[in-house]
């Protein structure tokens, strides 16, 4: 049984969490995105998504990096930093981000109902949309035997909190910072369980550009610990299709 929690798409980028914990390897991340008719996002694609409102509090794979996109500073998400926050010592399992080129250019919260590129298999795969709607199918998407039959399985009660609970690695981070934020209360954050993450700020800038390029700091992996992903909202399928929903 595999549960895949997914978010709205922002400029085609979305977050996928497997079984409610950090449990995806880099090879599985690529396979999972492929199953969603998607690819691992590039840094440029992630930065575009960030610039139109995409943020999470979870480490996830993109092409070449493990990142958390942050708009609003929060002490428990990416060490209070904003921008695309890069974890430089990525030696463990994380969530993943995916990019679907067929998604609309800004926010798309229509429900994803299946894994179009999954192949035949015995696994019950449940896609859980942000509003809790669930779509179940049998199949498989993993191609790496180590992902299907891991030699050291992830313990079920680990990594729903901070990733430092299962990794003693203390590594550096690189993050891209963006312009100033102005606090207002967020009204609904069903994905976020830690109450300290319920009062993010909001941006009123139209676009964001790295201020002074990249900045480097150091810390532990414990920054992205909130169980859940995108902050706020709900989604269901409704009405006539304007652009292709993902997956196609």
């Amino acid at each position: 049984q595999i549960d895949l929690n997914i978010t709205c798409r922002f400029a085609g980028v979305f977050h996928v969490e497997k079984n409610g914990r950090y449990s995806i390897s880099r090879t599985e991340a690529a396979d999972l995105c492929k199953a969603f008719n998607s690819t691992l996002p590039t840094m440029a694609q992630m930065e575009k998504a960030l610039s139109i409102g995409f943020e999470t509090c979870r480490y996830g794979f993109i092409e070449g990096h493990v990142v958390i996109p942050r708009i609003h500073p929060n002490s428990i998400c990416a060490a209070n930093n904003t921008g695309v926050y890069i974890l430089t010592s990525n030696t463990s399992q994380y969530d993943t981000y995916c990019f679907n080129a067929s998604a609309p250019p800004e926010e798309d919260c229509t429900s994803v109902t299946d894994l179009p590129n999954a192949f035949d298999g015995p696994i019950t795969i449940t896609i859980v949309n942000r509003d809790g709607t669930r779509y179940v199918q049998k199949g498989e998407y993993r191609t790496n035997p180590e992902d299907i039959y891991p030699s050291n399985p992830t313990d079920d009660d680990v990594s729903s909190g901070s990733s430092s609970e299962r990794s003693s690695t203390s590594g550096g981070y690189i993050f891209y910072t963006f312009s100033t934020v102005h606090p207002i209360p967020d009204e609904d954050s069903p994905w976020i369980t830690d109450s300290t993450d319920r009062i993010p700020a909001t941006r009123d800038q139209d676009t964001f550009h790295p201020s002074g390029g990249s900045h480097t700091t150091h810390g532990s992996e414990s920054d992205g610990h909130s169980h859940g992903s995108q902050e706020g909202g709900a989604n269901t399928t409704s009405g006539p299709i304007r652009t292709p929903q993902i997956p196609e």
């Epitope: 709205c8 139109i52 409102g53 926010e107 954050s189 909001t202 706020g232 006539p240």
Partner: antibody, heavy 117, light 112 residues
């Protein structure tokens, strides 16, 4: 039926405040980025502000930045525009509009805001 | 921001005759998903704008088939195959590729 209904417009003095509301029905409000667009008398259309589905990310036109605040209450299916420090040039019909996402944009009928002494 | 330019700004028409309005954007509105994020609206006197065409060429629900949209990238056209009296008003093109939404100046269509 998909519907957006604006309210809260009226006559206000320069420097004053007003809050517009937009009640949504007939669709899943919490799925959509929402927008405010305005039209000054005899003029064209001007986008004012937008807010993503969660309410956690907003954008504003330069002409209203720092004076207007967009917000939403997904539990009430309602969009708001708080307008402070109003100026004569803010006089317009204000439309709330559903973002396009995977479906065509939907507009309300508009609410007239007149800023005059 | 993406700039939108419409022409002509005024279009006197004869009922039963065709009419055409042009819209040009300062950057391509063709998204990687293959759709052009260009909408056409008609604002009749005293009314709110009503959607005619979305994604460049898709007629909105309830819009008569005499209206058609075409074009790709930066150049778009709205055509009315046979103008009727009820088609008078101001026509706007709008780009929906990115926020801020931006609009053409409007084309006023009136009966000769």
């Amino acid at each position: 039926e998909v519907q957006l209904l604006e309210s809260g417009g009226g006559l206000v003095q320069p420097g004053g405040s007003l809050r517009l509301s937009c009640a949504a029905s007939g669709f899943t409000f919490s799925n959509y980025t929402m927008n405010w667009v305005r039209q000054a008398p005899g003029k064209g259309l001007e986008w004012v502000s937008s807010i993503v589905s969660s309410g956690g990310f907003t954008k504003y036109a330069d002409s209203v930045k720092g004076r207007f605040t967009i917000s939403r209450d997904n539990s009430k299916n309602t969009l708001y525009l708080q307008m402070n420090s109003l100026r004569a040039e803010d006089t317009a019909v204000y439309y709330c509009a559903r973002g396009w996402s995977s479906q065509p944009a939907i507009w309300g009928q508009g609410s007239l805001v007149t800023v005059s002494s | 921001d993406i700039q939108m330019t419409q022409s002509p700004l005024s279009l006197p028409v004869t009922p039963g005759e065709p009419a055409s309005i042009s819209c040009r954007s300062s950057q391509s509105l063709l998204h990687s998903n293959g759709y052009n994020y260009l909408d056409w609206y008609l604002q009749k006197p005293g009314q709110s704008p009503q959607l005619l065409i979305y994604l460049g060429s898709n007629r909105a629900s309830g819009v008569p088939d005499r209206f058609s949209g075409s074009g790709s990238g930066t150049d778009f056209t709205l055509k009315i195959s046979r103008v009727e009296a009820e088609d008078v008003g101001v026509y706007y093109c709008m780009q929906a590729l990115q926020t801020p939404w931006t609009f053409g100046q409007g084309t006023k269509v009136e009966i000769k």
